[in-house]
């Protein structure tokens, strides 16, 4: 039997990834820096499939259901060219209908649909955040 890798204390494991949900308020850049500070190649989380989105949403809903959460998706050139900060391919998308526009170039999991959909928001807003790494 293959031994499952372990995650850092307080992080949860699912399908070869470790996830850390932090209920502290950070702007997007500071949240990313804090994720990196935990080591192991951690970044703000990429969400690459409906399967992964559902697992994360279920986990977070066990803690709270009202606060949006930063993920690792951003639009660094401010041209609606979104990319994952960890370099993952931007294929799966889960934008809610009213996501884009304004000075909103960072993505959050929205509490409006149980964290299954994303909205863009101003990157300087201070919010909870989700980190991810491969152990």
């Amino acid at each position: 039997q293959i031994q499952r890798p372990s995650c850092a204390p307080g992080w949860f494991y699912h399908k070869s990834n470790c996830y850390g949900y932090f209920r502290k308020l950070r702007n997007w850049s500071d949240a990313e820096l804090e994720c990196q500070s935990y080591g192991n190649g951690a970044h703000l989380a990429s969400i690459l499939s409906l399967k992964e989105a559902s697992t994360i949403a279920e986990y977070i809903s066990g803690y709270q259901r009202s606060q949006p959460i930063w993920i690792g998706l951003h639009d660094p050139q401010k041209r609606q060219q979104w990319q994952w900060i960890d370099g993952a391919m931007y294929l799966y998308r889960s934008w809610s209908g009213k996501s884009m526009g304004g000075n909103k170039h960072c993505a959050e999991m929205s509490s409006n649909n149980n964290f299954l959909t994303w909205s863009s928001n101003e990157c300087n807003k201070r919010q909870h955040f989700l980190c991810k790494y491969r152990p």
Partner: antibody, heavy 120, light 107 residues
Framework: EVQLQQSGAELVRPGASVRLSCTVS????????IHWVKQRPEQGLEWIGW????????QYASKFQGKATATSDTSSSTVYVHLSSLTSEDTAVYYC?????????????WGQGTLVTVSA | DIVLTQSPATLSVTPGDGVSLSCRAS??????LHWYHQKSHGSPRLLIK???QSISGIPSRFSGSGSGTDFTLTINNVETEDFGLYFC?????????FGAGTKLELK
């Protein structure tokens, strides 16, 4: 090379049940979900549900709740679907399928299908 | 549940023709739409993922486009091996759903 090998055709009586198998080779069965898909004769595809062989967790389309039950045996890299209280509406080809890796949702790998015929 | 409506139900073409198959979703599914081809008595085969992403080993005559609710699969210069059923599938939300299919047949 990833392969999904399904069990052979079944002829079953109305009201009976049947268990179909899908044996996976070429990747670790615990790394992703295995899905089941139904195709009735000359018709489209219907998603039945998935199982996570690592945990045994399952999710089903509401239409198949109580009709289909997915299980797995990681030691033999095999997943099963149990179909109960069979009627003529359950006559179909059943496919197991999976994605290329956990971070994707499209069905890359398919079994060859198992034909289930429900007839008196 | 998200309903996928494919049109036309049947398309009669001659080899060498170009064709477009439509898949319309009952609500926005972003770009989370995949296309499959199924020959008679065979298993489905993935052609295009996430609306427009090509698949290794699939001929370049197959291409996809669209986002939101309207999607198109285009086949340039249809070959005889392309005849059969084409299905779209969404992975935007559970339950996963498929379209009823478009049958591509020889004129």
């Amino acid at each position: 090379e990833v392969q999904l090998q399904q069990s052979g055709a079944e002829l079953v009586r109305p009201g009976a049940s049947v268990r179909l198998s899908c044996t996976v080779s070429g990747f670790n069965i615990e790394d992703d979900y295995i899905h089941w898909v139904k195709q009735r004769p000359e018709q489209g595809l219907e998603w039945i549900g998935w199982i996570d062989p690592e945990t045994g967790n399952t999710q089903y389309a509401s239409k198949f709740q109580g009709k289909a039950t997915a299980t797995s045996d990681t030691s033999s890299s095999t997943v099963y679907v149990h179909l109960s209280s069979l009627t003529s509406e359950d006559t179909a080809v059943y496919y197991c399928t999976t994605t290329s890796y956990y971070g994707s949702d499209e069905f890359v790998y398919w079994g060859q299908g198992t034909l289930v015929t429900v007839s008196a | 549940d998200i309903v996928l409506t494919q049109s036309p139900a049947t398309l009669s073409v001659t080899p060498g023709d170009g064709v477009s198959l439509s898949c319309r979703a009952s609500q926005s599914i972003n770009n989370n739409l995949h296309w499959y081809h199924q020959k008679s008595h065979g298993s489905p085969r993935l052609l295009i993922k996430y609306s427009s992403q090509s698949i290794s080993g699939i001929p370049s005559r197959f291409s996809g486009s669209g986002s939101g609710t309207d999607f198109t699969l285009t086949i340039n210069n249809v070959e005889t091996e392309d005849f059969g059923l084409y299905f779209c599938q969404q992975s935007n939300s559970w339950p996963l759903t498929f379209g009823a299919g478009t049958k591509l047949e020889l004129k």
